[in-house]
């Protein structure tokens, strides 16, 4: 009897949907695997007789529940199928946005870039999929624990009237208010402000 694949899970970030599993212990030899998805009541092969322990399902529709399954095979024998259900629009993890930061005197000017979606048009981003897409930004003085959060209305934001000659750190994540779902925070970007340009009267 061939044992089934173990630890089957869907690793999905920005709709890059990779079904992953682990090969079970099997004394007779090396196992191969077949992974399928349910399409109009019929299971279709996606990865056949592969020696890999993953299969790319990024071409699935982003909407609705998908049933995926994988089994192990050896010669003419095979294991039972292991099934999982996956809804990309609900289950994918939102990766960190890009961020450009520029210092202008005592202000930080930030521009945000929504994560790109692979296997789509070149310009297609997570913003195109989720109508409620917005950003959470948090910033803090470097070396302190007190943080300030803002929710920009647009793809850019300006932090004004900061302390001069002080290093501020900023990070951003995508946020979906209608789903109360947040994405991964970007790596912090830290920049030092310069002098206050206001002229005394």
């Amino acid at each position: 009897m061939v044992p089934p694949p173990e630890n089957v899970r869907m690793n999905s970030v920005n709709f890059k949907n990779i079904l992953q599993w682990e090969s079970p212990a099997f004394a007779k030899g090396n196992l191969t695997f077949t992974a399928q998805y349910l399409s109009y009541r019929i299971f279709q092969d996606k990865c056949m007789n592969t020696t890999l322990t993953e299969c790319d399902f990024s071409s699935l529709s982003k909407y609705g529940d998908h049933t995926l399954r994988v089994r192990a095979e050896f010669a003419d024998e095979h294991s039972d199928w292991v099934n999982i259900t996956f809804c990309p629009v609900d289950d994918t993890i939102i990766g960190p946005p890009g961020m450009q930061v520029e210092v202008l005197a005592d202000s930080l000017h930030m521009r945000f870039l929504a994560p790109k979606i692979e296997n789509e048009y070149e310009t297609w981003t997570m913003k195109n999929v989720y109508n409620s897409w917005t950003y959470n930004v948090q910033y803090w003085k470097n070396g302190t624990d007190e943080k300030f959060q803002i929710t920009p209305q647009y793809d850019f934001e300006v932090l004004r009237n900061l302390e001069p000659w002080t290093t501020y750190c900023v990070q951003v994540r995508g946020f979906l208010p209608d789903r109360n779902k947040a994405g991964e925070w970007s790596e912090p970007v830290c920049e030092q402000t310069t002098h206050d340009e206001t002229v005394p009267s």
């Epitope: 993890i93 990766g95 470097n142 624990d145 990070q171 994540r173 779902k181 991964e184 790596e187």
Partner: nanobody, 125 residues
Framework: QVQLQESGGGSVQAGGSLRLSCTVS????????MGWFRQAPGKEREGVAT????????YYANSVKGRFTISRDNAKNTAYLQMNSLKPEDTAMYYC??????????????????RGQGTQVTVSS
């Protein structure tokens, strides 16, 4: 430097429950992933559970699935591991771990950048 403080370990009879807590302090960036791993004497480290703090997405080792639940309170920078139906083979030192990087939901927590000192869980039959 990031500091992690675990609590909630102890001794319990088989079938009992414990709730572990892990609080992150002195951090300089928001945590994307929090998790727990364990190590029993003479055995290899084992990832137990991880959580993506943004959406609350969770992942469990097969050995604890259905018995353990990981959760988080982002406002308190705290992760919890509710352990029910404990078995003698769950006896181990349990460690909390966190990471600020992305894409780590399915990585065992012992691979995370910051780890706590651990809290002992002993389950007797």
């Amino acid at each position: 430097q990031v500091q992690l403080q675990e609590s909630g370990g102890g001794s319990v009879q088989a079938g009992g429950s414990l709730r572990l807590s892990c609080t992150v302090s002195r951090y300089t960036a928001s945590v994307n992933y929090m998790g727990w791993f364990r190590q029993a004497p003479g055995k290899e480290r084992e990832g137990v559970a991880t959580i993506f703090t943004g959406a609350g997405t969770t992942y469990y080792a097969n050995s604890v699935k259905g018995r353990f639940t990981i959760s988080r309170d982002n406002a308190k920078n705290t992760a919890y591991l509710q352990m029910n139906s404990l078995k003698p083979e769950d006896t181990a030192m349990y460690y909390c771990a966190v990471d600020f990087r992305g894409g780590l939901l399915y990585r065992p927590a012992y691979e995370y950048t910051y780890r706590g000192q651990g809290t002992q869980v002993t389950v007797s039959s």
